[in-house]
């Protein structure tokens, strides 16, 4: 049996392909006949499924040059807080438990993304632990009025994350130390194993594997919402918007943004992955009567999709009788 192939390297040249190169084994132990290349899609980090990206004023932004991800801060006008009474000096308020917890989560959030795609070289994934499936009680549809608390991370379990393991696929490579693996998903991490096989392979088997992790490039348009946005009227001056999710997104859809308004689309609503998975859309509350337009945009691991075409909806004014009742 030959020794393992050496110096396995992989790079992506498109959103559906990985190029893999390696060197022959140092000990072929006979005539090298062929290599077996095996590849397996890797699950996304569980944190990406559980984290509620609507609770942050930050979104992950991919830097294409070096494959890393940065956190882009959305800074609002600084608010002056009065801490020491009407005219007293302004001081730092003591942190609440919830704020301390939120800071801890923020640190974890940063760590995940600073390590994310580091130089496109990946280490083997440790065994994943089973997680309890817990429904989150009283998950509100609107993130607009929520304060950022320790609920930035959901315990709700995404079906995709539940013990997901993907099959290995194989191909045989004759007389060369490179191959192109095709039909892959965009912006997705793969483990690639290479085995060397000599003339005795049928009888004695092939070598153990040498392996590498690599991620495909993002695909243009993969994060675009594929179908029409529809709406249904709901009681109490609210409506429910529904839309289909991108079928083959760049890695994972983290959240959706809704831009809506009556004259101009000046209102924004963020819908987390978890909320979308639970409801298939989002509810817009406390709308004044009138005609509205709305557009939706998905945000994936690699950035934003396109805004959808506008959907037109209206909120009816309550009749006098209804107003009287209420």
């Amino acid at each position: 049996v030959p020794s393992i192939p050496l110096d396995v390297l992989s790079a992506s040249n498109s959103s559906s392909q990985l190029i893999v190169k390696w060197n022959p084994p140092s000990l072929p132990n006979g005539n090298l006949s062929y290599y077996i290349v095996r590849w397996q899609r890797q699950p996304q980090d569980g944190y990406l499924y559980r984290h509620n990206y609507c609770s942050k004023d930050k979104i992950p932004i991919r830097k294409y040059a070096d494959g890393t991800i940065d956190i882009e801060e959305v800074t609002e006008n600084p608010k002056t807080e009065v801490c020491g009474g009407e005219k007293g000096p302004c001081c730092a308020c003591p942190k609440t438990e919830a704020e301390k917890q939120a800071e801890k989560e923020e640190a974890e959030y940063r760590k995940v993304f600073e390590n994310f795609l580091h130089n496109s070289i990946f280490v083997p994934r440790p065994e994943r632990k089973r997680r309890d499936v817990m429904q989150v009680a009283n998950t509100t549809m609107s993130s607009r009025s929520r304060n950022t608390t320790a609920a930035d991370t959901y315990n709700i379990t995404d079906p995709e994350e539940l013990e997901t393991e993907y099959p290995f696929f194989e191909s045989r490579v004759d007389n060369k130390e490179r191959t192109v693996i095709s039909n892959l998903r965009p912006f997705t991490l793969y483990r690639i194993d290479i085995h060397s096989c000599n003339h005795e392979a049928e009888k004695l088997g092939c070598s153990a594997s040498n392996f590498v992790f690599a991620r495909t490039m993002p695909a243009e348009g993969a994060d675009d919402i594929p179908g029409p946005v529809t709406w249904e009227p709901r009681p109490e001056n609210s409506i429910f918007l529904k839309w289909p999710e991108p079928e083959n997104p760049n890695g994972l859809i983290l959240m959706y943004e809704i831009k809506y308004g009556s004259q101009v689309e000046d209102q924004r609503e963020c819908v987390s992955r978890q909320e979308y998975r639970k409801y298939g859309g989002a509810k817009l509350n406390r709308l004044n009567p009138g005609n509205y337009t709305a557009r939706i945009q998905a945000t994936s691991l690699s950035g934003n999709g396109s805004w959808t075409d506008p959907v037109f909806f209206y909120v009816q004014a309550k009749t006098g009788y209804e107003n009287f009742i209420h």
């Epitope: 077996i36 393991e165 099959p167 088997g205 083959n248």
Partner: antibody, heavy 121, light 107 residues
Framework: QVQLQQSGAEVKKPGSSVKVSCKAS????????ISWVRQAPGQGLEWMGR????????NYAQKFQGRVTITADKSTSTAYMELSSLRSEDTAVYYC??????????????WGRGTLVTVSS | EIVMTQSPATLSVSPGERATFSCRAS??????LAWYQQKPGQAPRLLIY???NRATGIPARFSGSGSGTDFTLTISRLEPEDFAVYYC?????????FGGGTKVEIK
């Protein structure tokens, strides 16, 4: 033309083990993956696991993990599936099946005739 | 695991007619889907792979379509030998899973 020949029917007691064999004749054996799929009477098909003899690598469905062992003997072109701690629900026809092609793994174009395993006290 | 749901459970058709049956996945499987035919006392036989490609030796009257979560197998003109049970199977995630089957019987 390659054929997969399976061992004969077995009757087993609950708690015991069964080992079913699948011999390939008439062609290449080692480089193709062999899967085991079972079918309870009047029921659908259920994938149990798979081995690539040339690599000696086996993968199992979570449901059977720890209870099933799939091995292969390259010298005799035979794959084996051993299922332990048998219970009555394991009564089924057990098929071995070969991958369609290397680049079309997980579709099965060649099947054995099946081995009926009956678990009864 | 991905649950594959086939409908209808039984289809009564006359020879020469067209038969269409459906397979739905609980989450997207792309085009990673196969169809098999199984006759009583026999092993399954691969008909279609990757949702729409006919396997070697399969007559042109068998065709497959669909992607994502919804798939269809069509037999354009039923021959007497086509009366059997038909299963779909996904290979997108482990474990591989099969649908519950559609039995095609003579009307």
């Amino acid at each position: 033309q390659v054929q997969l020949q399976q061992s004969g029917a077995e009757v087993k007691k609950p708690g015991s083990s069964v080992k079913v064999s699948c011999k390939a004749s008439g062609g290449t054996f080692s480089s193709y993956a062999i899967s085991w799929v079972r079918q309870a009477p009047g029921q659908g098909l259920e994938w149990m696991g798979r081995i690539i003899p040339i690599l000696g690598i086996a993968n199992y469905a979570q449901k059977f993990q720890g209870r099933v062992t799939i091995t292969a003997d390259k010298s005799t072109s035979t794959a084996y599936m051993e299922l332990s701690s048998l219970r009555s629900e394991d009564t089924a026809v057990y098929y071995c099946a070969r991958d369609h092609r290397f680049d079309y793994a997980w579709y099965f174009d060649l099947w054995g005739r099946g081995t009926l395993v009956t678990v009864s006290s | 695991e991905i649950v594959m749901t086939q409908s209808p459970a039984t289809l009564s058709v006359s020879p020469g007619e067209r038969a269409t049956f459906s397979c739905r996945a609980s989450q997207s499987v792309g085009s990673n889907l196969a169809w098999y035919q199984q006759k009583p006392g026999q092993a399954p036989r691969l008909l279609i792979y990757d949702a729409s490609n006919r396997a070697t030796g399969i007559p042109a009257r068998f065709s497959g379509s669909g992607s994502g979560t919804d798939f269809t197998l069509t037999i354009s003109r039923l021959e007497p030998e086509d009366f059997a049970v038909y299963y779909c199977q996904q290979r997108s995630n482990w474990p591989l899973t099969f649908g519950g089957g559609t039995k095609v019987e003579i009307k």
